[in-house]
Interface confidence: low
């Protein structure tokens, strides 16, 4: 049945009308408007942009648009006492200092309030000592250093290259290794694609470019001072010593020109293998300390940033549903940027703006969606997903009862090669069906569907003829909705060719060079990829809000549950002797997955056959679909991570950006051979299998016939 039957509207107000209203030229215009000055969270400029968006969304025709403010912990450099790193000689004289700012891009020389590169939430301090190069500072890199190479990082300043994992995990790993400071740098191997010029002549990172970013380990807590509750006017705030997720050692980021000066003098151990070498003309020696001639020189960090409780502002727009106003489909993306935000976030915010305008146009012509659509412009995402998390904490009771889906809308592009989608398995079929109806913007795929170009360029590793869809991890504003509240979530953007471009993220990520011109000149001059992303995000929202039966297929969850159960069983089977000794069995989990598969199959059959003209039965079936994601939530959360409550998916404990399946079992098994008390460790594995099996079985039962 077509979507428009729900609200008795004229046939022209269907998905096609919504999609046809989306215009690349408007997205381009909005991007320009949003990127002319910095919009750092907590600043007046970002408050003014919030008010502008509020005003424009009202003009576009939304029913209401409100600002929701919170007072959260943010972090800023000291304007009169800049952060930097020195090489000091034996007399303590500074013989080299890193740069205090990035050279501004052409045309932006006179822009004020460009925050210099810093690691948000770094404590103050001036540690000095020998340097140890720790590669990407991943868990496995520290294993290599400590276990294989017998190098002790205790009391050392470590230097790590950006990439592969979230920077907060790097800092946590360094802390656990005993380091007293961390220097983060962008290596050309990861942030300089071969054959491309540096900005402003291309999209590569120049030597003076630096990646900003927060270094928190919040594990979904939101504002560090008010975990679990909104940072409102009457909030009780923790003391800074009890704040969640703050680093305990000074951290600072630098570019590769400055990194060269630090790394070229490194002595000590040679790199263990080629995977530890980047592209600078340095030996990539691990250290500790400098080589012969320079062995008396040390590195000193000077960090003076401050943590401050600051007001932030979300913009929340509402388009009331005509039939089920108490069912919410949410489209949200952040507004705050580190500097100009040319890609992150404004390429996403511009797309949201155009989606709102298109929905508003339809509404002005008399149309309404079946369900309520909420639009959000989040603040302080860059400081730890704070705006979205505080709003969700404030509205958690409404969201857990009424939330149908959340679609994220950060950066629309990180490349211009093909589509990239991460979502709940419930949305696989929605994404497949939608992309089959959209035109591919890719060269060589004229007249072909987006599904076809996406599948060709990014094939599924498991299913031939289908595109890759990844697990949701974190590092963006869907986190609280999916990982904490269990609301079906998804995200889509255009991405690079991961096969040929092995650098991490895009080269100019979080640098001053992420400008409007970067996008307009190098990534998407015609804004055709932005338009495609608008069609995907907007099309998903349209279908989720307007289809009579929710476009969720529970059978796809059954398929992945089997895959994840096999995967975690295989990991456990690396320890066959211990599994025997401690009587570890996965039978309960496989049995629960089998039951889920059978019940999901029967539910899907009933979904085809029931009387859709009966509003009570329709609502009942839709509620079973809506609440399925919720059924995977464990109210007790994961061990030591109470705000990660989804039993099937959580951000990896080793990389916040990546999703891990059956994370409770995975973490219990991780490095289990090194645990001092194997009996206790394997007992925890068994407990986690029990929790997972129970949760899958309980979720299955929500799909059974109700009586």
């Amino acid at each position: 049945k077509s979507s428009n039957e729900a609200t008795n509207i004229t046939p022209k107000h269907n998905m096609k009308a919504f999609l046809d209203e989306l215009k690349a030229e408007n997205i381009k215009k909005f991007l320009y408007n949003f990127t002319q000055i910095p919009h750092l969270a907590g600043t007046e400029q970002n408050f003014q942009l919030a008010k502008q968006i509020q005003s424009q969304w009202k003009e576009f025709g939304l029913d209401s648009v409100e600002l929701a403010h919170y007072d959260v912990l943010l972090s800023y450099p000291n304007k009169t006492h800049p952060n930097y790193i020195s090489i000091i000689n034996e007399d303590g004289n500074e013989i080299f200092n890193t740069s205090l700012f990035e050279p501004p891009p052409p045309g932006y020389e006179n822009v004020s309030d460009i925050v210099p590169p810093f690691s948000a939430f770094s404590p103050q301090g001036m540690p000095e000592g020998d340097l140890v190069y720790v590669n990407y500072a991943r868990t496995e890199d520290f294993f290599k250093l400590e276990r294989d190479m017998k190098i002790n990082c205790s009391g050392k300043i470590v230097i790590a290259r950006y990439g592969k994992v979230f920077r907060g995990n790097k800092v946590k790993n360094a802390q656990l290794a005993g380091a007293k400071g961390v220097i983060l740098y962008s290596d050309p191997a990861d942030y300089f694609a071969p054959g491309v010029k540096s900005y402003p002549d291309g999209w590569n990172l120049p030597g003076g470019g630096v990646q900003r970013g927060n270094i928190l380990n919040l594990n979904g807590a939101g504002d560090p001072l008010t975990p679990g509750y909104p940072a409102n006017e009457y909030a009780y705030r923790r003391g800074i010593a009890e704040a969640v997720g703050l680093p305990s050692i000074p951290v600072h980021p630098i570019g590769y020109y400055d990194a060269q000066k630090l790394l070229e003098k490194m002595g000590g151990s040679a790199p263990p293998d080629s995977s530890w070498r980047g592209s600078l003309k340095v030996p990539y020696n691990v250290g500790p300390g400098f080589t012969g001639n320079f062995s008396t020189q040390k590195v000193k960090m000077h960090i003076h940033s401050t943590n401050e409780v600051t007001r932030i502002y979300n913009v929340i727009g509402t388009l009331r549903g005509a039939v089920e106003p108490d069912r919410y489909v949410i489209l949200g993306g952040h507004r705050d940027s580190w500097v100009f935000g040319g890609i992150d976030p404004q390429s996403g915010a511009a797309v949201v703006h155009e989606i709102v305008r298109s929905f508003g146009t339809l509404k002005k012509e008399g149309w309404r969606p079946r369900r309520t659509i909420l639009f959000a412009s989040w603040d302080a995402e860059e400081f730890g997903l704070l705006g979205s998390t505080e709003w969700a904490e404030e509205n958690s009771r409404l969201l857990q009862e009424r939330g149908v889906a959340y679609i994220n809308a950060d950066s629309s592009i990180e490349g211009n090669y093909t589509l990239r989608v991460d979502c709940t398995p419930l949305m696989y079929s929605l994404v497949h069906n939608l992309t089959k109806e959209l035109k591919s913007p890719d060269e060589g795929f004229e007249g072909k569907s987006l599904y076809e170009s996406w599948t060709k360029k990014s094939p599924s590793p498991e299913f031939s003829g289908m595109p890759r869809i990844s697990k949701l991890g974190s590092g963006n504003d869907f986190e609280v909705f999916f990982q904490r509240l269990g609301i079906a979530s998804g995200r889509a953007r255009y991405t690079k060719n991961w096969e040929t471009n092995k650098f991490s993220g895009y080269p100019l990520y979080h640098s001053v060079y992420e400008t409007y011109e970067l996008v307009e000149k190098f990534y998407d001059p015609m804004f055709k990829y932005h338009l495609t992303v608008a069609q995907v995000r907007g099309g998903m929202v349209f279908e989720l809000a307007n289809s009579i039966v929710l476009p969720f297929d529970c059978r796809d969850y059954a398929v992945v549950l089997r895959k994840y159960a096999d995967k975690i069983y295989s990991i456990s089977m690396k320890h066959p002797q211990e599994m025997k000794t401690y009587s570890v069995s996965f039978d309960s989990l496989f049995s629960a997955v089998k039951n889920f598969t059978e019940i999901a199959s029967k539910f899907s059959e009933r979904l085809q056959d029931f009387d859709k003209s009966n509003p009570i039965v329709l609502r009942m079936m839709n509620d079973q679909l809506m609440f399925l994601e919720r059924a995977f939530i464990d109210p007790l959360g994961l061990p030591d991570r109470p705000f990660y409550r989804h039993v099937i998916y959580a951000p990896s404990s080793h990389n916040k950006y990546a999703g891990e399946s059956f994370p409770g079992i995975y973490d219990a098994l991780f490095d289990i051979e090194s645990k001092v008390d194997p009996s206790k460790a394997w007992g925890e594995v068994k407990r986690q299998i029990y929790v997972a099996a129970f949760t899958v079985q309980a979720a299955a039962e929500t799909l059974s016939e109700v009586a």
Partner: nanobody, 124 residues
């Protein structure tokens, strides 16, 4: 106990073919990806090919692409490697190896067990 037993090696002339087999026992063969790896005298071990648990996905090293074919028979718990157009540089001990996972993508390959190997010598 996991056991992998390779067979089918021998001396063969360049341009000719050979078919290696690997009989697996001690684990649920149909639930795991399987690999062939090889080691030439005095050289590092080289990954050759992987086949997913159900045979639906196969990946090959560039050096053997188009000449070698990996296959499996889950009913017989056996892995195969059909080697055509053999070259002198294919001379090596060939090992079959069990993946720790489903073996569905070359980026996620880690073998936890491998066999004793079978020697293939390509010489005129």
């Amino acid at each position: 106990e996991v056991q992998l037993l390779e067979s089918g090696g021998g001396v063969v002339q360049p341009g000719r073919s050979l078919r290696l087999s690997c009989a697996a026992s001690g684990f649920s063969f149909s639930g795991y990806g399987m690999h062939w790896v090889r080691q030439a005298p005095g050289k590092e071990r080289e990954w050759v090919a992987v086949i997913s648990y159900d045979g639906s996905n196969k990946y090959y090293a560039d050096s053997v692409k188009g000449r070698f074919t990996i296959s499996r028979d889950n009913s017989k718990n056996t892995l195969y490697l059909q080697m055509n157009s053999l070259r002198a540089e294919d001379t090596a001990v060939y090992y079959c190896a069990k993946d720790a996972n489903w073996g569905q993508h070359p980026d996620h390959t880690s073998f936890d067990y491998r066999g004793q190997g079978t020697l293939v010598t390509v010489s005129s």
